[in-house]
C-alpha cells in the first residue's frame, strides 16, 4: 500500500508522518467507541453470569491496550492476546456455529436456539461486532476521522487483525460437530478469502472436531437445485476431508421456514422438508 | 459481611408469600444474590437468582412459582402460590465470581398448611 | 435438565483416615472447572469450601481437597477431624442461556467415628 512504500523508499519513522499524511480510506472509528464497548461488556456479563467474573474496566484497557500508540498497519495477533486471555470462554460440544457471508441469519438463528453460539455470542465478538476503531502511531488518540481499509490501506489494521484473532481461537476450541451456515445466493458459496475460508477452517482441530456440517442457506423461492454439489462446496469438503474431519453438507430451501420451525418443532408443516 | 433472611412463617396453600434477603457490610448492586432451599432432611435446591442489574434466572421447575426481585437494601423472593412441597427452609446467599455462594444467611422457616 | 450425581449417599470414616465423595454431571460444567464444594452442619446454612472444582475457599483447611474436569470431580479430605462430620454437597454451573445456571447434587453424609 502505498504509505508502507513510503516507509520502505524513504526509511521514515512513523511519528515523523505530518499528521495529515495518517488519511485513511476506510471510515474512522465508531462515535463514542470506548462507552460502547464498555457498555456492550457490562450487559453481556449481566446477560452471561457465567462471565461474572470478568472485570469490565480490565477489559476495555486490554483493548485499548492493543491498538492505541500503534501504527494501525502494523497491528499483530500478539497485541490481542491480553484481550483475548481476559475474554476466554468456553462453548460446549456440537454448540458452535460458523458463518459466511449470512450474518443477518446465523445470528437469528442462535437467538431461537439459544443452546448454539455464533462468535458475535461470545463476549469478543459481541463487544465487536459492527464496530471500527484505530488509533495513531505515537499518540494516546483514537482516530475517528479514518481508519485503514483492508484492499486500499493494509490487512494489519486494528479490525481485520482483531477478527482474524478472534475467529481463529473460537476455531480453535471447537469441538464436536461444527455447523457451518452458508450463503446459497453467493457466486462463491465457499469463499477460500472469507474469514471462514481463510482462518476458521484451517484452525479447527480434527483431535476435537468430529465433522463439519455444512447448512446451505438458498435464497430463491423456486430453487430447488441441490447446493450441496456445487464445486466451491466440493472445495470445502476436499479441505476438511484432508484434515481428516468429516464433512456432511445440508440444503436449506426455505430459510424463512427453517427458523420458524427452529421456534415451532412440534408445528406439523415442519414434519416435511425445509 | 453478611445477609440475612426474614419473613418465614406458617401460611396455608395458595396463600402468596414474599421473604426477604438483607445485606449488610456490601452492596447490592456489586453482587448477584441467590436463592436456595431445603426441604426438612433433604438436600440443596437452587431456585434462582438476580444480577446486579436486576436480569433473574430461574431453575427449569421453579418458573412461575417463584419471583425474585431486589430494592437498593434488599432481594425478595416471591412464593406466588405455596404449596406443601415449598416447606422448606430459604437460603439467600451471595453469588461471587466463581460459585453460587461464599456468603449465606441462616435461613428462613416457611411451613405450608392447611 | 442437568442432574449432579453423588456418591456415596453416606460414608463413615475414622479419624486421621480419608474420605472421598465423587460427583459426576450428566453434562460438561461451564468451563470444565465450574464446580463448587459446600459443606452443612445440622443446623447451619452451607459453607464454601471448594470453588473452581479445586480452588480452597479462604478459611478452609488444606486437608480438603478437590479434582476433577467436565463431568467427573471428587472431593478429598485427608486427615479427617471429627469436626468434619457434616453434609456435603457438589454444585456445578452452566451456561444460563440453555440450561439451569446452577444444580446441586444429592449430598454425601460424613459420619466421624
Known amino acids: 500500500s502505498g504509505l508502507n512504500d513510503i516507509f520502505e523508499a524513504q526509511k521514515i519513522e512513523w511519528h515523523e508522518l505530518p499528521r495529515w499524511r495518517q488519511q485513511w480510506s476506510g471510515s474512522g472509528t465508531t462515535s463514542r467507541f470506548p462507552e460502547t464497548v464498555l457498555a456492550r461488556c457490562v450487559k453481556y456479563t449481566e446477560v452471561h453470569p457465567e462471565m461474572r467474573h470478568v472485570d469490565c474496566q480490565s477489559v476495555w484497557d486490554a483493548f485499548k491496550g492493543a491498538f492505541i500508540s500503534k501504527y494501525p498497519c502494523n497491528i499483530t495477533e500478539e497485541d490481542y492476546q491480553p484481550l483475548v486471555k481476559l475474554g476466554t470462554q468456553t462453548v460446549p460440544c456440537n454448540k458452535t456455529l460458523l458463518w459466511s457471508r449470512i450474518k443477518d441469519l446465523a445470528h437469528q438463528f442462535t437467538q431461537v436456539q439459544r443452546d448454539m453460539f455464533t462468535l458475535e455470542d461470545m463476549l469478543l465478538g459481541y463487544l465487536a461486532d459492527d464496530l471500527t476503531w484505530c488509533g495513531e502511531f505515537n499518540t494516546f488518540e483514537i482516530n475517528y476521522q479514518s481508519c485503514p481499509d483492508w484492499r486500499k490501506d493494509c490487512s494489519n489494521n486494528p479490525v481485520s487483525v482483531f477478527w482474524k484473532t478472534v475467529s481463529r481461537r473460537f476455531a480453535e476450541t471447537a469441538c464436536g460437530v461444527v455447523h457451518v451456515m452458508l450463503n446459497g445466493s453467493r457466486s462463491k458459496i465457499f469463499d477460500k478469502n472469507s474469514t471462514f475460508g481463510s482462518v476458521e477452517v484451517h484452525n479447527l482441530q480434527p483431535e476435537k472436531v468430529q465433522a463439519l456440517e455444512a447448512w446451505v442457506i438458498h435464497g430463491g423461492r423456486e430453487d430447488s437445485r441441490d447446493l450441496c454439489q456445487d464445486p466451491t462446496i466440493k472445495e470445502l469438503e476436499s479441505i476438511i476431508s484432508k484434515r481428516n474431519i468429516r464433512f456432511f453438507c445440508k440444503n436449506i430451501y426455505r430459510p424463512d421456514k427453517f427458523l420458524q420451525c427452529v421456534k415451532n418443532p412440534e408445528d406439523s408443516s415442519c414434519l416435511s422438508g425445509i | 459481611q453478611s445477609v440475612e433472611e426474614s419473613g418465614g412463617r406458617l401460611v396455608t396453600p395458595g396463600t402468596p408469600l414474599t421473604l426477604t434477603c438483607t445485606a449488610s457490610?456490601?452492596?447490592?448492586?456489586?453482587?448477584?444474590m441467590s436463592w436456595v432451599r431445603q426441604a426438612p432432611g433433604k438436600g440443596l435446591e437452587w431456585i434462582g437468582f438476580?444480577?446486579?442489574?436486576?436480569i433473574t434466572y430461574y431453575a427449569s421447575w421453579a418458573r412461575g412459582r417463584f419471583t425474585i426481585s431486589k430494592t437498593s437494601t434488599a432481594v425478595d423472593l416471591k412464593i406466588t402460590s405455596p404449596t406443601t412441597e415449598d416447606t422448606a427452609t430459604y437460603f439467600c446467599?451471595?453469588?461471587?465470581?466463581?460459585?453460587?455462594?461464599?456468603?449465606w444467611g441462616p435461613g428462613t422457616l416457611v411451613t405450608v398448611s392447611s | 435438565a442437568q442432574v449432579l450425581t453423588q456418591t456415596p449417599s453416606s460414608v463413615s470414616a475414622a479419624v486421621g483416615g480419608t474420605v472421598t465423595i465423587n460427583c459426576q454431571a450428566s453434562?460438561?460444567?461451564?468451563?470444565?472447572?465450574?464446580l463448587s464444594w459446600f459443606q452443612q452442619k445440622s443446623g447451619q446454612p452451607p459453607k464454601l469450601l471448594i470453588y473452581?472444582?479445586?480452588s480452597l475457599a479462604s478459611g478452609v483447611p488444606s486437608r480438603f481437597s478437590g479434582s476433577g474436569s467436565g463431568t467427573q470431580f471428587t472431593l478429598t479430605i485427608s486427615g479427617v477431624q471429627s469436626d468434619d462430620a457434616a453434609s456435603y454437597y457438589c454444585?456445578?454451573?452452566?451456561?444460563?442461556?440453555?440450561?439451569?445456571?446452577?444444580?446441586f447434587g444429592g449430598g454425601t453424609e460424613v459420619v466421624v467415628k
Open positions: 438476580i444480577s446486579k442489574t436486576a
Open positions: 457490610g456490601f452492596s447490592l448492586s456489586s453482587y448477584y
Open positions: 454444585q456445578g454451573e452452566f451456561i444460563c442461556t440453555s440450561a439451569d445456571c446452577f444444580v
Open positions: 446467599a451471595r453469588v461471587d465470581a466463581y460459585s453460587a455462594g461464599d456468603l
Open positions: 473452581s472444582t479445586s
Open positions: 453434562q460438561s460444567v461451564y468451563s470444565d472447572n465450574r
